[in-house]
């Protein structure tokens, strides 16, 4: 799996999970989230050569096609596969609210 | 939806469905498929600016982040959303076989 266990420990230019910290105020301008200050969101990046973690039959076809016709820019792309939620604390007036924001943290990637 | 009805009728540099015909022998080197000779596979391509058909909360976060730090290459990517199968005819010896290959045709796209 193209997850932290593999991607963070290897030199990998192909599609893989990359660490990325997001600061809510600084990076997104979101001032309404009280806690946490930011979080390890991660992201997916890298090339998708033939058979590199292809998600579907179409992505396998596309990556094979791309080896013959690279100028077509019709290659698969490295995107998130497994995502996890993030628990946040915010306030409505003086009332604290705890909420789970779904699909906020990328755990693994795929070529799609 | 970023499907043929919208994308094939509009000039759209952002993420959208693009037409692509794949010839099995010429483009993939697959000589085993007897019929069809090829098919309209389509593919997804284009930019994923903030809120353009974002698939998840993470892709919305990422596209917003990317406006501030484009050099990070941490932007969402335009990939297939809905896929359809393709029915093919091939032979094992002289025996014809009909099979449905799943996820061969892209019908719509998303930013993920």
């Amino acid at each position: 799996a193209l997850d932290a266990a593999y991607c963070f420990r290897n030199v990998q230019d192909n599609c893989c999970l990359r660490p990325l910290y997001i600061d809510f105020k600084r990076d997104l301008g979101w001032k309404w989230i009280h806690e946490p200050k930011g979080y390890n969101a991660n992201f997916c990046a890298g090339a998708c050569p033939y058979l590199w973690s292809s998600d579907t039959q179409h992505s396998r076809v596309l990556s094979l096609y791309n080896t013959i016709n690279p100028e077509a820019s019709a290659s698969p792309c490295c995107v998130s596969q497994d995502l996890e939620p993030l628990t946040i604390l915010y306030y409505i007036g003086k009332t604290p609210k705890i909420e789970q924001l779904s699909n906020m943290i990328v755990k693994s990637c795929k070529c799609s | 939806a970023l499907d043929a009805a919208y994308c094939f009728r509009n000039v759209q540099d952002n993420c959208c469905l693009r037409p692509l015909y794949i010839d099995f022998k010429r483009d993939l080197g697959w000589k085993w498929i007897h019929e069809p000779k090829g098919y309209n596979a389509n593919f997804c391509a284009g930019a994923c600016p903030y809120l353009w058909s974002s698939d998840t909360q993470h892709s919305r976060v990422l596209s917003l982040y990317n406006t501030i730090n484009p050099e990070a290459s941490a932007s969402p990517c335009c990939v297939s959303q809905d896929l359809e199968p393709l029915t093919i005819l091939y032979y094992i010896g002289k025996t014809p076989k009909i099979e449905q290959l799943s996820n061969m045709i892209v019908k719509s796209c998303k930013c993920s």
């Epitope: 990359r18 660490p19 | 730090n69 050099e71 290459s73």
Partner: antibody, heavy 119, light 107 residues
Framework: EVQLQESGPGLVKPSETLSLTCTVS????????VHWVRQPPGKGLEWMGL???????RYNSALKSRLTISKDTSKSQVSLKLSSVTAADTAVYYC?????????????WGPGTLVTVSS | DIQMTQSPSTLSASVGDRVTITCLAS??????LAWYQQKPGKSPKLLIY???SLQDGVPSRFSGSESGPEYTLTISSLQPDDFATYFC?????????FGQGTKVEIK
Amino acid sequence: EVQLQESGPGLVKPSETLSLTCTVSGFSLTTYNVHWVRQPPGKGLEWMGLIWNTGGTRYNSALKSRLTISKDTSKSQVSLKLSSVTAADTAVYYCARDPVPNKWHFDFWGPGTLVTVSS
Amino acid sequence: DIQMTQSPSTLSASVGDRVTITCLASEDIYSNLAWYQQKPGKSPKLLIYDARSLQDGVPSRFSGSESGPEYTLTISSLQPDDFATYFCQQHHAYPFTFGQGTKVEIK
């Protein structure tokens, strides 16, 4: 063990290009970002620029026209090139890593290498 | 660029003293501040990040706090190993900028 090590000529002539290499071990350049920071003798620290794990770069606008940072991931090396140097570029040059890309503070530093600009 | 004004530039203290160094940011940096210790001929060592988070392996006598645009590094009980120069750094906006440094010397 995470390590960074700067190397390059200790003396560069004015108007020439300063070239330094940062060789890293214990982590991958496709996972972490690497920054360059310099410190003139007896003075404070100046952030010069960085190279992302994905290969993109960001430079201090004060140096942007003269600075190029690149990397060779297979060799675990990051390079710095600073053109048209003057005596004001005499400094100890450090490469450093941020603990998570976009955290922007530096948890590991190289020992630094002194570069003197003089004819 | 965000200016980081650090004070004092030099501080004379004795072992066991409580020492405070301050850094004033020219604009809001939303707690995106780090503190480093540097000894002569050595590279800086990270002490504190996010204004108050202690880096792994750093003694608990070091602490960070903030009050508006002013950020403070406190050494609760100065040890012989703490005589060094200390720098603050904002990690909020490009280009990342440092304070001019505070040299803590033996009284």
